[in-house]
Amino acid sequence: KSPIFGPEEVNSVEGNSVSITCYYPPTSVNRHTRKYWCRQGARGGCITLISSEGYVSSKYAGRANLTNFPENGTFVVNIAQLSQDDSGRYKCGLGINSRGLSFDVSLEVSQGPGLLNDTKVYTVDLGRTVTINCPFKTENAQKRKSLYKQIGLYPVLVIDSSGYVNPNYTGRIRLDIQGTGQLLFSVVINQLRLSDAGQYLCQAGDDSNSNKKNADLQVLKPEPELVYEDLRGSVTFHCALGPEVANVAKFLCRQSSGENCDVVVNTLGKRAPAFEGRILLNPQDKDGSFSVVITGLRKEDAGRYLCGAHSDGQLQEGSPIQAWQLFVNEESTIPRSPTVVKGVAGGSVAVLCPYNRKESKSIKYWCLWEGAQNGRCPLLVDSEGWVKAQYEGRLSLLEEPGNGTFTVILNQLTSRDAGFYWCLTNGDTLWRTTVEIKIIEGEPNLKVPGNVTAVLGETLKVPCHFPCKFSSYEKYWCKWNNTGCQALPSQDEGPSKAFVNCDENSRLVSLTLNLVTRADEGWYWCGVKQGHFYGETAAVYVAVEERKAAGSRDVSLAKADAAPDEKVLDSGFREIENKAIQDPRLFAEEKAVADTRDQADGSRASVDSGSSEEQGGSSR
């Protein structure tokens, strides 16, 4: 018997779509071999309609696809716009059509529902609203109007014009009688339930002259949209529930065991702990639509998600919903990068951010995730030379090492820097990644003076002490500006005496500024790197003042000012223009991106995501 398994029978109606899942043993050979869907002919052959190698028959052009899920041992054939001609016997299989690795599937497509014996068919999605129109003649204009539902053999009164409402419909039904000019009454049912489906009869009058109209209400459970995203990547759920629920609380939930749909995020401020730091619920439009972005996708994020609207902010019967089945592809194109980076107060971190290497010219961004309300991510820095004012002198985004990775360096760390940060570009929105910065106990490895004052026209020498652990690293000094950090010449002054228990491999490397000018004022960094991979940095602010006494200045560690954690930026520092992002794709399709660089900067607590992928501030 064949090890391939699938649905033996699929029944649908014209115009519908089907998703046929075929299961195979996930051996390494099976995972990578050809997958196919073919139609069995009268004489025993099987004509390929679609395969995993890219072939699509003209019969399926524009309406079918085949997706392999090697990690699950499944492949899915989606066929849209079904017609009765699609009825027949098919095979889904592996390898060559004529071989035995296949499974027989019977597809039966029947005619769509028509207007049979004067029955009006209403097809409405679960949770939405239906309006059943009931015409009547003039002689029944003043008579009782009613709507019945056929339950078995008996009609059961649902609502009438005298004020009766069946308890099953309380709070979600009304009967509207149109103005005198129109011989029509309407019954509007909101928050449709699956149990509302069935045959209805509306009636004007109660005698033999009454006007009757049959209605067939079909309530559709939303077909889950299949979404396939890469491990460590990002997914965006776009939820359009209609303007009638524009002012109702929205939610995204994930179906777990039983009837439970655990809230992932809602507009009432609830957020599941597993999504801390990696989820944003984007503001609603006037039509009630909204979107949810989840980054740093994990294997356990796979499952069925529902978005909906209900005053409780969670799934209830009658909630209008949309559904997705999220598959997380473990054979990811997105490289592993640390999800947690650790630094010490006063120290630094260097974060590696992956991006789609086909989009090397895209603008790179780094933002700070804030959990308040529905989550937001104000930008801190971009690759076009913009840095948020509060981060001047201590934050830099570098295009290095390139080829699919950029680097973000943040120094002068304080406990307020703990939190979640997102790496993103204005290109492929699937390549958003999340990193958590944790501030741990310890001392910075690099030692520099605090604030330094240079004298116009004189020479200034600023020391940077590197412990022996960095003996194999390249050591550098650079001058920070909002486009990066320009390398400067520096001198190796031999072993440092700033470290206890550190041998001759420690180093004192000095920056020398000859004939200081006003242009020399600013932030200077010393740091270590290996090739294009950056490690720790330390920052010094050099102020320039008028000459008071002759001679050069040599700054020592003993003259350091306040501790780094207490450093207050002088109010006179230049503030970069708070420009708005021009690219509307930045946060998927959110529209309100202009405020993503606002100046609010509240304190943030560190939240441990329990990640096993951690790195220290000085590692790469």
């Epitope: 398994f5 029978e9 699929v10 699956l194 079909q218 077909e223 179906q255 799934l315």
Partner: nanobody, 126 residues
Framework: QVQLVESGGGLVQAGDSLRLSCAAS????????MGWFRQGPGKEREFVAT??????????YYTDSVKGRFTISRDNAKNTVYLQMNSLKPEDTAVYYC?????????????????WGQGTQVTVSS
Amino acid sequence: QVQLVESGGGLVQAGDSLRLSCAASGRTFTTYGMGWFRQGPGKEREFVATITWSGSTNYKYYTDSVKGRFTISRDNAKNTVYLQMNSLKPEDTAVYYCAASTVLTDPRRLNEYDYWGQGTQVTVSS
């Protein structure tokens, strides 16, 4: 919760037919598939047949040993799933359990079903 109640089991002769019913009540709007499993004397519970649905599309899955003999169907209005069993054999003797699932990635796996009925005994004598 979703409650499942099976009925229709009994004692029949080999070659006879039986129709099992499974009526679902409660929060059935969250279910996406219902199926039948069976547990013969001294055996593990095994997959028999499942029907899943999406809108007006139904997908029917069967285990090899019942193909062509058993048919699964559902009545949406009554929230009921049926298993029509024809040409019954003594090896079909088992307690038949109805199960419902909210998220079904492989209909053959027991652990993908969230709700279970109490079971109905089917005995086929030779």
